[in-house]
Interface confidence: medium
């Protein structure tokens, strides 16, 4: 899984799956996550605190999959069959960035370097697992 800043080695083997507790990330199509996440947060509380900064953007509705995309990084899907957190695929990130970055720029916030789409898998395959956009956001 080649995702640079998103360190796939974090959480390898040791950490078990845990229920998603972050309010923004409930009801998005999966309910188990694993910490540390892909951004290095060691607890859901820590992840939720940073994720809260995106709440206005999610509420604005610049992209229907923004919430799912953010949650895939801050509270990535966990399954006992795979030892690493599973992020979103790159196209979902690129579409969210394309539509949401202009709104962020209006308020003098650039798209965060930590959400660099280029480091996400291009598509889901056995060697680089990632989540495609859900059919119903």
């Amino acid at each position: 899984l080649e995702i640079g800043r998103f360190d796939p080695e974090r959480g390898r083997g040791a950490a078990p799956c845990q229920a998603v507790e972050i309010p923004m990330c409930r009801g998005i199509g999966y309910n188990l996550t694993r910490m540390p996440n892909l951004l290095g947060h060691t607890s859901q509380g820590e992840a939720a605190a940073e994720l809260a900064e995106f709440a206005p953007l999610v509420q604005y509705g610049c992209h229907s999959h923004l919430r799912f995309f953010l949650c895939s990084l801050y509270a990535p899907m966990c399954t006992d069959q795979v030892s690493t957190p599973i992020p979103a695929c790159r196209p979902m990130c690129e579409q969210a960035r394309l539509r949401c970055a202009p709104i962020m720029e209006q308020f003098n916030f650039g798209w965060p370097d930590s959400l660099d789409c280029a480091r996400l898998p291009t598509r889901n395959d056995p060697h680089a697992l990632c989540m495609e956009a859900p059919e119903n956001a």
């Epitope: 690129e94 579409q95 209006q106």
Partner: antibody, heavy 124, light 113 residues
């Protein structure tokens, strides 16, 4: 009335770096709702989007050029710049700078202002 | 990348007559989030920079005469000029901005008979 003016070397040797600057007048490059773009047009051919930058420094590059491309912005000088390394004859083109407008309420987006273009020839 | 294809590539029109240019995209340009179709038309007059004619499928840019209109849906788009005038000569380009990299069609050259 917003104006964009490209400047830079008109002749670049193969393998060297092409450098262009776009000076923006009649408006602030730091205004929200816009990104600032480079587009090129090889002689007698169509248009190709190169990349864009916001005043914050966030960039969007065409993947076909990304490995050789750097776009930067200098808000204090109200200008943005293009650097394209390791050029070949295929990079010979008229290079345009343009403003890409984005309306956050409607989602409408388009290139609304263009520079007059500058011809860059890659030749030894 | 999304491929944009023009037909015809050149067009010779009598002044006062209508003209129609088609553009096809390799995937849908409709954004289901906001309902917008991200297809624009630009005109490049001889020796000039491109200028916006139509944005977001059918919205005329400021100062563009109402003889220009844009229509279409999904992957098939049309630019119509109800009555061609001498000043309409040049190359017309469609462009998509639904997905990076933004891409242009190869252009349709319009000349006056």
């Amino acid at each position: 009335q917003l104006q964009l003016q490209e400047s830079g070397s008109g002749l670049v040797k193969p393998s060297q770096t092409l450098s262009l600057t776009c000076a923006v007048s009649g408006g602030s490059i730091s205004s929200g709702g816009y990104s600032w773009s480079w587009i090129r047009q090889p002689p007698g051919k169509g248009l190709e989007w190169i990349g864009s930058i916001y005043h914050s420094g966030s960039t969007y590059y065409n993947p076909s050029l990304k490995s050789r491309l750097t776009i930067s912005v200098d808000t204090s000088k109200n200008q943005f710049s293009l650097k394209l390394s390791s050029v070949t004859a295929a990079d010979t083109a008229v290079y345009y700078c343009a403003r890409f407008y984005y309306d956050i309420l409607t989602g409408y987006s388009y290139f609304d202002y263009w520079g007059q273009g500058t011809l860059v020839t890659v030749s030894s | 990348d999304i491929v944009m294809t023009h037909t015809p590539l050149s067009l010779s029109v009598t002044p006062g007559e209508p003209a129609s240019i088609s553009c096809r995209s390799s995937r849908s340009l409709l954004d289901t989030d906001d309902g917008n179709t991200y297809l624009d038309w630009y005109l490049q007059k001889p020796g000039q920079s491109p200028q916006l004619l139509i944005h977001t499928l059918s919205h005329r840019a400021s100062g563009v005469p109402d003889r220009f209109s844009g229509s279409g849906s999904g992957t098939d788009f049309t630019l119509k000029i109800s009555r061609v005038e001498a000043e309409d000569v040049g190359v017309y380009y469609c462009m998509q901005s639904i997905q990076l990299p933004w891409t242009f069609g190869q252009g349709t050259k319009v000349e006056i008979k």
